[in-house]
């Protein structure tokens, strides 16, 4: 299975030697080291951590470790002019103010430079007005408000609960609805699991806890001032008015103690149904405005944050390949955190650190991977995936020619129930085969494989006896590699039981309470789940970098393409009359998928039979596998989203975190019944079917015999 080139370790021991070298105790030690102070992007503390990681990766044995810096737009609160929200009376007096910072966790009371909760990239402003409660501020929530309830958000301040979708989509939706400000809050229904105590006695969110986060709508652009190009020393920067993705209205996050004080006075319309009610003891009235006794009171926002061009630092480590040094397998995760980063990102960074150490140990014993492995510690992920995107923009020509795969390594855990994997279909078989070889860390699965516990706890909705593997969306550093450059990508982490825990993400996400102790006391005291994630991520990198034939199965792409074509066709068929009127046909797409399936099948047969000792033929076959993901890239990108260029997958236009299949067709069909010009709208559907069919056919042809 694995290459024996340039090594003094026998092939069957390569992967085992690598996996055996990974130690839970080391991950624990690294996590502790990375979480003692805040490492906010653009700060001296995060620069110092970058230099520390550079130094340690060199000690671990990598061939070279360099810092790559960029000057990008970041956002910070004003230290002397704090952000807050008030309830004001008819005289303009502030009768209630939201908190200025979170109560620090025990043991951290004297830590300096804890950034108070804020919505990064919010413009400055002091809007005042009536409040409207908009549930999760999803597209469908605004449809319900505007179309069914006839509630106008224009000129109002909206309050939305966190969860379900990326916060930037909430803000975009509020802007489009005409709101003049947005308040984001964490409802206990979404961030407080029943039967669990709040931190520091458990892993639930206390009432004073607040989720930080950026509210950009970058659509893959990277630094808002230099879209498409690296923010280097000679960069031409856009003016702030032309910057990509910045919100136009003030936004601020609060905890549920403060939300209670705002929501308890709400009047106006009752909530449309139970799905609009959270767990606070408030009526969840939609508004607008406060109820009778309080109707003269208004809400006022005080936002004074500033956007600043600031230097950020990626750490890039190289372990040169012995046989194919011009083929890159990349393992990357971010280093910057909102505060301590106990889970996000340092549970991931600690795993990357241990993977680097293990690879370095093998290298010191004389082993090298077949292909080059690049390790990355990205900066400014929390501010819009900026470090990874700028580096990929700077190195795009190398990456598009040499990039084999990208494995993401943000948070290793978001729970401790089972494995969660999102990846390209090309990696399905790799993930299946690897997890069959790894031991499950789960209670009740002693002596069983990870594949078995994962499949039992998270079964595939389509294929019995197989685990669920999800589509890649965005909201993390794989975005530029997969969605823009078309490099096969994957991610893995341990997750919660989605059946029983209906809250969004994990309760303490992006709060001050995301500490080392949170992980060590409540999530993974033995660090066995971290170790398993290290084995999965590291094992994937090892196989991708070391197997003679790339561990990609193109037949799995054929299967999902058929599934996605069926799905988008069934969405379109909700409009049978219009399809007939405007002669909308999916025949070209289904034909292309059929061709892809047949060609992929034949390619796989050839892959079994070819002479692997012929380096030219081996390289040719591997290049066809490597470039298959690339073949799904449309150089023109998706409509109004030029940096989302993958035709099969894109982040949902309604939720950046979620992946959408055939996104061009999906978006053309979305809410089509409300379009003012149906002929034009259905024309765009037809165009998108054409683009998808062409792309699938073109991708299929890259797998055909070359001559």
């Amino acid at each position: 299975k694995s290459s024996n080139e340039a090594t003094n370790i026998t092939p069957k021991h390569n992967m085992k030697a690598f996996l055996d070298e990974l130690k839970a105790e080391n991950i624990k030690k690294f996590l502790y080291n990375f979480t003692q102070i805040p490492h906010l992007a653009g700060t001296e503390q995060n620069f110092q951590l970058a230099k520390q990681i550079q130094s340690q990766w060199k000690e671990f044995g990598l061939d070279s470790v360099e810092l790559a810096h960029y000057d990008v737009l970041l956002s910070y609160p004003n230290k002397t002019h704090p952000n807050y929200i008030s309830i004001i009376n008819e005289d303009g007096n502030e009768i209630f103010n939201t908190s200025l910072f979170e109560p620090p966790p025990p043991g951290y009371e004297n830590v300096s430079d804890i950034v108070p909760p804020f919505s990064a990239f919010s413009p400055q402003g002091m809007p005042e007005g009536d409040l409207v409660y908009v549930n999760y501020a999803r597209t469908e929530d605004f449809f319900k408000l505007e179309r069914d309830m006839k509630i106008n958000c224009s000129g109002k301040i909206v309050i939305a609960r966190y969860g379900k979708v990326f916060r930037g989509n909430k803000v975009k939706n509020a802007q489009l609805a005409g709101a003049k400000g947005v308040i984001l809050y964490s409802d206990p229904a979404d961030y407080f699991a029943p039967g669990v105590k709040s931190y520091p006695d458990g892993w639930n969110l206390p009432g004073g806890g607040v989720q930080r986060g950026n509210i950009l709508n970058l659509n893959g652009a990277g630094d808002p001032l230099t879209p498409g190009y690296p923010a280097n020393e000679y960069a031409y920067r856009r003016g702030i008015a032309e910057a990509v993705g910045l919100p136009s209205i003030p936004v601020h996050p609060i905890g549920y103690y403060d939300a209670q004080k705002l929501l308890e006075k709400m009047g106006g319309s009752a909530p449309p149904d139970s799905s609009w009610r959270g767990s606070l003891k408030v009526p969840y009235n939609v508004g607008p405005g406060f109820t009778g006794n309080f109707s003269t009171q208004k809400v006022k926002m005080h936002i004074h944050s500033t956007n600043e061009v600031t230097r950020i630092y990626n750490v890039i480590g190289t372990l040169r390949g012995a046989v194919e040094p011009d083929r890159y397998v990349i393992l990357g995760g971010h280093r910057d955190s909102w505060v301590f980063g106990g889970i996000d990102p340092q549970s991931g960074a600690a795993v990357v650190h241990e993977i680097v150490r293990s690879f370095g140990t093998l290298k010191k014993e004389g082993w090298r991977p077949r292909r080059t492995i690049l390790f990355a510690s990205w900066d400014a992920e929390e501010f819009g995936l900026l470090g990874s995107t700028e580096w990929a923009e700077e190195n795009s020509r190398l990456l598009q020619e040499r990039g084999v795969a990208y494995i993401n390594a943000d948070s290793s855990i978001e729970g401790n129930y089972t494995l969660r994997v999102d990846c390209t279909p090309l990696m399905y078989s790799l993930v299946h085969n690897l997890t069959k070889e790894l031991k499950s860390p789960d209670e009740g699965f002693e002596g069983k494989s990870l594949y078995e516990s994962w499949t039992k706890k998270s079964p595939s909705p389509e294929f019995s006896g197989m685990p669920r593997i999800s589509k890649l969306g965005s909201g993390n550093d794989f975005e530029v590699f997969f969605q823009r450059l078309g490099i096969a990508s994957g991610r893995a982490r341990y997750t919660k039981n989605w059946e029983t825990n209906k809250f969004s993400g994990y309760p303490l996400y992006h709060s001050v309470y995301e500490t080392y102790e949170l992980v060590e006391k409540f999530y993974d005291p033995m660090f066995k789940y971290h170790l398993t994630v290290a084995q999965v991520r590291g094992g994937m990198v090892f196989e991708l970098a070391n197997s003679i034939v790339l561990p990609f199965d193109c037949r799995d792409y054929a299967v999902v393409l058929r599934k996605y074509a069926d799905k988008i066709y069934s969405i379109s068929m909700k409009h049978p009359q219009e399809m007939k009127t405007y002669s909308v046909s999916f025949d070209s797409l289904f034909s292309a998928v059929k061709n892809f399936t047949e060609i992929a099948s034949k390619f796989s047969e050839r892959l079994q039979d070819f002479d692997k000792s012929n380096p030219i033929v081996l390289r040719m076959m591997n290049d066809q596998l490597m470039f298959l993901e690339r073949a799904f890239i449309d150089p023109l990108g998706l409509p109004d989203r030029p940096f989302y260029r993958h035709v099969i997958y894109a982040p949902s236009s309604h939720n950046k975190y979620a992946g959408e299949s055939f996104p061009g067709i999906y978006d053309a069909l979305f809410d089509i019944e409300s379009k003012v010009d149906p002929s034009k709208a259905w024309g765009e559907v037809k165009r998108q079917i054409y683009v998808a069919a062409f792309t699938v056919q073109a991708a299929a042809e890259t797998l055909s015999e070359v001559a």
Epitope: Y84, F96, N97, T98, S99, L100, F101, E102, P103, P104, P106, E109, P206, G207, G208, G209, G255, Y257, D258, Q260, K261
Partner: nanobody, 123 residues
């Protein structure tokens, strides 16, 4: 040991000012809302003022509104009560009391008390 120690009380003439302090030890003042409570001779306890952990909100009993100011210095782990325009009816033992809920936005129940400091307003 968790404790609150009040100081600054004394005898003062009506219309004059006094500043009470409350030093906290054994727990982080920065995480808790704090209260001043008083007990006049022969009477029950009366709540006087509350300040949130971050100082963003202050609430006062109607009887002291506009005359008393509650403040805090989290770096010094100390709570203050500035009392101006004192009246004879302000005569009482003044206690500082810690709110039991971390991060509370309004006064809740108290779980730690000081021993009190006597304020006498008399001509």
């Amino acid at each position: 040991e968790v404790q609150l120690v009040e100081s600054g009380g004394g005898v003062v003439q009506p219309g004059r000012s006094l500043r009470l302090s409350c030093a906290a030890s054994g727990f982080p003042l920065i995480s808790y809302g704090m209260n001043w409570v008083r007990q006049a001779p022969g009477k029950g306890l009366d709540w006087v003022a509350f300040i949130t952990y971050d100082g963003s909100n202050r609430y006062y009993a109607d009887s002291v509104k506009g005359r008393f100011t509650i403040s805090r210095d989290n770096s010094k782990n100390t709570l203050y009560l500035q009392m101006n325009s004192l009246k004879p009816e302000d005569t009482a033992v003044y206690y500082c009391a810690k709110d039991r809920i971390v991060g509370a936005r309004v006064p809740d129940a108290y779980d730690i008390w000081g021993q009190g400091t006597m304020v006498t307003v008399s001509s």
